[in-house]
């Protein structure tokens, strides 16, 4: 079909905010569980601690986590798992003050990546029981299909 | 030609990761040499320490550098050089801890800019022999044609 | 009308840089006044301390502020006001060193949001007389209509 001004295909988008964050027993990572705050298009699906890619393609991904933790460095790793392998897409790293009153930093990163159908995207904090602020305007994850 | 659903022109994108970083003798800057990790479209080409713009237009540019340096503040400057002049587009600045074990920070910034055909884009760290982590998920540079 | 290759609708964009920043008497916030550095499309209008949305839709918003302040944590809040209510869209937070020579940090964040016609977008620093660097490549605000 020909694209009219009205029909012109829009970018699929998904903006996610936290439900909670957990560390499994004996795990040295903290994972965030996500819920949609904004969704346009059908190609992305929040599934608990991951996001499933239904439409393969090139995406702008962005991630922010708000840390309230005195551990010397904090940060998040955004990874995709699919086709039998795991790949780190990007990381954000922030040195933290040792004083609890000062230890308050958001860490934002983003990039453009090719995602495959069936990939599961996740945000991992490589610390057990990381102290996060799960406010929806401080910690979030997003996708734009380009 | 009329655009059909299939023909609809996609955004040109380029996501670059480091090959190496060098400071020329007697230089007070560190430059990063780039290689493509993802490219769609023909309008952008990695050229060692710079990226050449072949298609003029409005681009989303993003840059992250991962610093492991105790210098009091670190950061990167993203500039374009063309038509006989140089222009700083955006900067990222991060204060660093003085203790080497804690001095680990990524610095991300991005923005939308009009780039001209023949412009050379570069990422400069205004420090001699800056200590960078050149992991491809910690230090990267990207473009999306809007 | 049918979209041809030439007519194909481009993304509206707006990239803003500071004019100044002020704290009203007895106010515990600092606001930035903006001017356009790049504009494409008619759907967004800088209006002093805010940006008016003329075309409703889904936007990528980004904000960076460059802080030169020893206050223990600094950061900015990006909000929209419209339809009789105010909503925080996203925040950036940065812990600051206590030594003035080291207290130099940019804070960048971004996300995708649905904005309504008539919304006013603003960047607030929740500190009285915050010490900002208003260089256009250190402090800026931007929008891309998706």
């Amino acid at each position: 079909a020909v694209l009219t001004q009205k029909q012109k295909k829009q970018h699929s988008v998904l903006h996610l905010v936290p439900i909670n964050a957990t560390s499994k027993d004996d795990s040295d990572v903290t994972e965030v569980m996500w819920q949609p705050a904004l969704r346009r298009g059908r190609g992305l699906q929040a599934q608990g601690y991951g996001v499933r890619i239904q439409d393969a393609g090139v995406y702008l991904l962005y991630s922010q986590v708000l840390f309230q933790d005195v551990t010397f460095t904090m940060g998040q790793v955004v990874s995709r798992e699919g086709q039998g392998r795991q790949e780190t897409l990007f990381r954000c790293i922030r040195s933290m003050p040792s004083h609890p009153d000062r230890a308050y930093n958001s860490c934002y990163s983003a990039g453009v990546f090719h995602l495959h159908q069936g990939d599961i995207l996740s945000v991992i904090i490589p610390r057990a029981r990381a102290k996060l602020n799960l406010s929806p305007h401080g910690t979030f994850l997003g996708f734009v299909k380009l | 030609a009329v655009l059909t659903q299939k023909q609809k022109k996609q955004h040109s994108v380029l996501h670059l990761v480091p090959i190496n970083a060098t400071s020329k003798d007697d230089s007070d800057v560190t430059e990063v040499m780039w290689q493509p990790a993802l490219r769609r479209g023909r309008g952008l080409q990695a050229q060692g320490y710079g990226v050449r713009i072949q298609d003029a237009g409005v681009y989303l540019l993003y840059s992250q550098v991962l610093f492991q340096d105790v210098t009091f503040t670190m950061g990167q400057v993203v500039s374009r050089e063309g038509q006989g002049r140089q222009e700083t587009l955006f900067r990222c600045i991060r204060s660093m801890p003085s203790h080497p074990d804690r001095a680990y920070n990524s610095c991300y910034s991005a923005g939308v800019f009009h780039l001209h055909q023949g412009d050379i884009l570069s990422v400069i760290i205004p420090r001699a022999r800056a200590k960078l982590n050149l992991s491809p998920h910690g230090t990267f540079l990207g473009f999306v044609k809007l | 009308a049918v979209l041809t290759q030439k007519q194909k609708k481009q993304h509206s964009v707006l990239h803003l840089v500071p004019i100044n920043a002020t704290s009203k008497d007895d106010s515990d916030v600092t606001e930035v006044m903006w001017q356009p550095a790049l504009r494409r499309g008619r759907g967004l209008q800088a209006q002093g301390y805010g940006v008016r949305i003329q075309d409703a839709g889904v936007y990528l918003l980004y904000s960076q502020v460059l802080f030169q302040d020893v206050t223990f944590t600094m950061g900015q809040v990006v909000s929209r006001e419209g339809q009789g209510r105010q909503e925080t869209l996203f925040r950036c937070i940065r812990s600051m060193p206590s030594h003035p020579d080291r207290a130099y940090n940019s804070c960048y964040s971004a996300g995708v949001f649905h904005l309504h016609q008539g919304d006013i977008l603003s960047v607030i620093i929740p500190r009285a007389r915050a010490k900002l660097n208003l260089s256009p490549h250190g402090t800026f605000l931007g929008f891309v209509k998706l």
């Epitope: 790949e87 990546f113 090719h114 | 990761v17 480091p18 090959i19 290689q35 493509p36 990790a37 993802l38 490219r39 023909r42 080409q45 990695a46 050229q47 060692g48 050449r52 072949q54 050149l134 992991s135 491809p136 | -």
Partner: antibody, heavy 116, light 107 residues
Framework: EVQLQQSGAELVRPGSSVKMSCKTS????????INWVKQRPGQGLEWIGY????????EYNERFKGKATLTSDTSSSTAYMQLSSLTSEDSAIYFC?????????WGQGTLVTVSA | DIQMTQSPASLSASVGDSVTITCRAS??????LAWYQQKQGKSPQLLVY???TLAEGVPSRFSGSGSGTQFSLKINSLQPEDFGNYYC?????????FGGGTKLEIK
């Protein structure tokens, strides 16, 4: 020290396929791209393509699309190039080379001879 | 694709001589040109990139120049180890293409 060690010479039949390897050492394999270059006996050099090992993204010279397939195995730090539907025109030395867009380190080459 | 034309195809010179090899691009490639040396039975070795920047470890008797469509590689005071084949390569955009080569022989 960066090293690129290529597999040995191949004698193959027309119409068949061949897969050659480029085993790397001395650097982080997944952080860099590998280029492949063809050199016919007594002739010049031809760029085939490039693969970024970190995610498998590849760029090909249009002339080699459908002919060459670039892959890698991160567990053994080895890059591979498969050539299909071989003809006498594919008889050549094939080099792997590191860095982009100029080539700083080269393998020693793999000689492929296509003959009935 | 951009065509690269090298000249001469071959030349003879003596140890101590200076020689110049030229390379012409079919379109403007600015300064995006590399030069390689290849000895018989060996892999190519990078000499120059960005038209004039010497690669690490390359002796200073080698120098590159030119921009746009015309480029040259000059070797001052030829040494015995300098004899072999020389290739130019544009790195303006993919596909990267090479010149046909220049064979430098001992007179």
């Amino acid at each position: 020290e960066v090293q690129l060690q290529q597999s040995g010479a191949e004698l193959v039949r027309p119409g068949s396929s061949v897969k050659m390897s480029c085993k790397t050492s001395g650097y982080t394999f997944t952080s860099y791209g590998i280029n492949w270059v063809k050199q016919r006996p007594g002739q010049g050099l031809e760029w085939i393509g490039y693969i970024y090992i970190g995610n498998g993204y590849a760029e090909y010279n249009e002339r080699f699309k459908g002919k060459a397939t670039l892959t890698s195995d991160t567990s053994s730090s080895t890059a591979y190039m498969q050539l299909s539907s071989l003809t006498s025109e594919d008889s050549a030395i094939y080099f792997c080379a590191l860095y982009y867009p100029w080539f700083t380190y080269w393998g020693q080459g793999t000689l492929v001879t296509v003959s009935a | 694709d951009i065509q690269m034309t090298q000249s001469p195809a071959s030349l003879s010179a003596s140890v101590g001589d200076s020689v110049t090899i030229t390379c012409r691009a079919s379109e403007n490639i600015y300064s995006y040109l590399a030069w390689y040396q290849q000895k018989q039975g060996k892999s190519p070795q990078l000499l120059v990139y960005n038209a004039k920047t010497l690669a690490e470890g390359v002796p200073s008797r080698f120098s590159g120049s030119g921009s746009g469509t015309q480029f040259s590689l000059k070797i001052n005071s030829l040494q015995p180890e300098d004899f072999g084949n020389y290739y130019c390569q544009h790195h303006y955009d993919t596909p990267f293409t090479f010149g046909g080569g220049t064979k430098l022989e001992i007179k």
